[in-house]
Structure formats: C-alpha cells, structure tokens
Amino acid sequence: HTAAQDNCTCPTNKMTVCSPDGPGGRCQCRALGSGMAVDCSTLTSKCLLLKARMSAPKNARTLVRPSEHALVDNDGLYDPDCDPEGRFKARQCNQTSVCWCVNSVGVRRTDKGDLSLRCDELVRTHHILIDLRHRPTAGAFNHSDLDAELRRLFRERYRLHPKFVAAVHYEQPTIQIELRQNTSQKAAGDVDIGDAAYYFERDIKGESLFQGRGGLDLRVRGEPLQVERTLIYYLDEIPPKFSMKRLTHHHHHHHHHH
C-alpha cells in the first residue's frame, strides 16, 4: 500500500484518510466508507469509490450501435458491498432486503428479488462503450489527433494499458471510446477498464478523484474538448438476465451539462 511518503497522501484517490501506521511503518491510506487500505500507486476500485462517495459527508456509420445486451446504469448511486479485494460482490442488497445481481462495474444485471436471490458469480464487464457528445467547435477535430489524445489520456492519467483501448470513433459531435478487457487478458497489476471508465466519467463531470490535481483539461491540438453529455454502455461476458425486454434499454447512464 504505497503512497507519497513525504506527506502521506494518496495521489490517486482523494476519498481517503492517510496515516503512517501501515505495514513496516509506511503510509497507509484507507478509503472512506469501507476503511480498506488502498494502493495509491494505481486507481482505486469503483466499488470502494462508490462506497466512499455514499459515506462522504454526499449506414456507413463508424459509430458503434450498442448490442441488445448492453447495460446502462439507470439505478444511480447505491452503497455497495465490496469483497476483501475491493471488488463488487456479485449480490447486492439494500436496507429493505431487496437484492439484485451486478456485474464487475456494479451495474444491475438481473431483476430485483429478495434475500433468496442467488448470484453465483461476479460476471465480468468485458466491453465498455463511452459515448460522448462535445460542444460545438469551429470545425471538426482531426480524428487521428483526437484518437491519439484520448489514448494518451487513458494511458497516462488512468494508467490503462493501451491494448485495452480498442477503438476511438468520431462523427462530429459524437465521440465513442471502446474499452475491451477479457478476463484472460487482464494480468495482475493491470488497471480494470471499469475503474478507468469510472475515473474518466468523474473527470468529465468535473469531479476528479485525483488528489490535488487540476480538473481534466482535454485539448486536441490546443483546442479545448468540452463534453456536454455522456452515455456509458456496459457489455458483460454473459448476457444479463431480465424477465422481460427492458424499455429503458437506451436511457442515459448519465446526463452531463457543463
């Protein structure tokens, strides 16, 4: 559990409390809400971040059409149960004993049930489609410049291995970023695409999770890239199990106005 030793802070997660009482007398940073020690050299898992947030005193188209199995997060914020490694537990329940199964990014993938509901395994979200619309600009961005800038962002800011950024599509004013990461591809120490997408989502909303860093200042060849709305679609390795086709299928994951 490394952290900046000089003043004992967590560069990658401001939703922490840090003290010099970790193993070997090192700085140890605990996530708000759960109290779990986090590794400040990489991104904190989305489950721990959500828990901290809930506890805080708060035609030849190049664009991808999400498949019929794509999930969107219509349930909003909740206080999740995380496993000992900080990942989402497969079954989540609220205070009134209503339970549901989630995928690895914490999005509900079954109908809601009672305490008898079984969720045998945590199903991995292996494909994330981040759909952005940017504010009007004088002209369209150069696609290759935009592609390079977004890949750089995920590599440098979120420490996501470049191989997991599958594609960047652009049809003004819509930008789509495809993240792909199968269970077999994810090695120990690799940033999870779900965590990278969540940090990006919070950055886009102007709610950066990084300690002391300025907000996200996205520029393509010096031109500001200002996002006015975001949709995020999640595709799981095993399709979700709902009792009927959900009409909410294409609802927004989040609606941003800047």
Epitope: C8, S19, D21, G22, M36
Partner: antibody
Framework: QVQLVQSGAEVKKPGASVKVSCKAS????????IHWVRQAPGQGLEWIGT????????VYNQKFRDRVTMTADRSISTAYIELSRLRSDDTAVYYC????????WGQGTTVTVSS | EIVLTQSPATLSLSPGERATLSCRAS??????IHWFQQKPGGAPRLLIK???ESISGIPSRFSGSGSGTDFTLTISSLEPEDFAVYYC?????????FGQGTKLEIK
C-alpha cells in the same frame, strides 16, 4: 514518550450521558487514528469506533452509531467519546488507543451505569 | 463484519513450554492482524503487528505468522509472566473486531 491519559471513573444513571476524554502527548496528534474500545466486566474487547483528529473524520461501529459521538480538539491534543442513553450493559472500562494496530493505550476509564 | 475466532479458548501449559495460539478470520484479511496480551486490571499491550512484525520492547520469544485467514501467535518458551489473556484484532476494514480471547493458564 507517547502517552494517552484518560479522564477519571464515572457513575451514571440509566438514560444519562457520559463523556470520556483521552489526552495525547509525545507524538503528532493529528496524524494518527484514535480508537475507542470497551471491555465489560469479565468480557472481551469491543471496538466502538475511531476518529482521525486531522479532519475529525469518525467511523462508528453500527451497534453504537445512534448513541455515540467522537470528537477531537486539536488545540489540546484531546479526543473525546460521548455515549448517550446509557444502559446497565454499558458498564465497562473504556479505552482509547492509537493507530490501526493500537500500539499505545490509555489507562482506561471505568463507567458504571446503575440506578 | 469480519469475525475472528480464536482457539483454544483456554490453553494450560507449564513455564518453559511452547505456546501456539490460533486466530482465524471469516474472510481474507491479508496480514492485517495484530496480537495483544492483557493481564487482570490492566490495558492490553501490543505484541505483534501486521501478522509478523515485532514490536520494540517485546521479548523475542513472541512471534507471529500467517496471512489470509489463518494466523498464529507463538511463545517459544513460556515465562511465568506470560500467563494472561491474548487477543487478536484485525484492521482490514471497518468495523475493526477482536477475537474472543485465549486464556493462557499455568498447568
């Protein structure tokens, strides 16, 4: 040397409140968690909660959440625990301890709840 | 919450013998376990932190081992002053909890 010195014994009636203090010295008070633990007569140790004095961020054991308040006064390096609506089964020795591994403990404060 | 189960509840040994105390966690807690000794009328005293890290001023006969869910406190050769109650405690996540204790008594 590091020391945690607690306030004296208290006798209270059921329904009353009690406030125990823990004065720290010999280290930087703001950079270490202060935990509160209690031990009923002849029983084991029970974690009540913790406070980080630097920003007063407090975490409570669910069992006590609606009755306990932890505070810290950085100017005098003192942490406090207040337990309200006392019951007879709150009779115990209350300890403060430092850091996640409780390396230094106060001497304990006996709280007796009796009508 | 994480439940810590200590065994045995009581251990009867003679001075000079080796004592092995066990603490089992209900889920994986890495090495976030700490061991304490408590004598009648006194506050607990930290013996071992993070499963195996020694503490300044604690005799070298006290050692700890384990990770994940199973942890052990070993006293290599018992001294008369070692007969007391021993507790394990975890700091993996909130709420922190203690084991129920092992009473080490003279045989």
């Amino acid at each position: 040397q590091v020391q945690l010195v607690q306030s004296g014994a208290e006798v209270k009636k059921p329904g009353a409140s009690v406030k125990v203090s823990c004065k720290a010295s010999g280290y930087s008070f703001t950079t270490h968690w202060i935990h509160w633990v209690r031990q009923a007569p002849g029983q084991g140790l029970e974690w009540i909660g913790t406070i980080f004095p630097s920003n007063a961020y407090a975490v409570y054991n669910q069992k006590f959440r609606d009755r306990v308040t932890m505070t810290a006064d950085r100017s005098i390096s003192t942490a406090y625990i207040e337990l309200s609506r006392l019951r007879s089964d709150d009779t115990a020795v209350y300890y403060c301890a430092r850091a996640s591994y409780f390396d230094y403990w106060g001497q304990g404060t006996t709280v007796t709840v009796s009508s | 919450e994480i439940v810590l189960t200590q065994s045995p509840a009581t251990l009867s040994l003679s001075p000079g013998e080796r004592a092995t105390l066990s603490c089992r966690a209900s889920q994986n807690i890495g090495t976030s376990i700490h061991w304490f000794q408590q004598k009648p009328g006194g506050a607990p005293r930290l013996l071992i932190k993070y499963a195996s890290e020694s503490i300044s001023g604690i005799p070298s006969r006290f050692s700890g081992s384990g990770s994940g869910t199973d942890f052990t406190l070993t006293i290599s050769s018992l001294e008369p002053e070692d007969f007391a109650v021993y507790y394990c405690q975890h700091s993996h996540s909130w709420p922190f909890t203690f084991g129920q204790g092992t009473k080490l008594e003279i045989k």
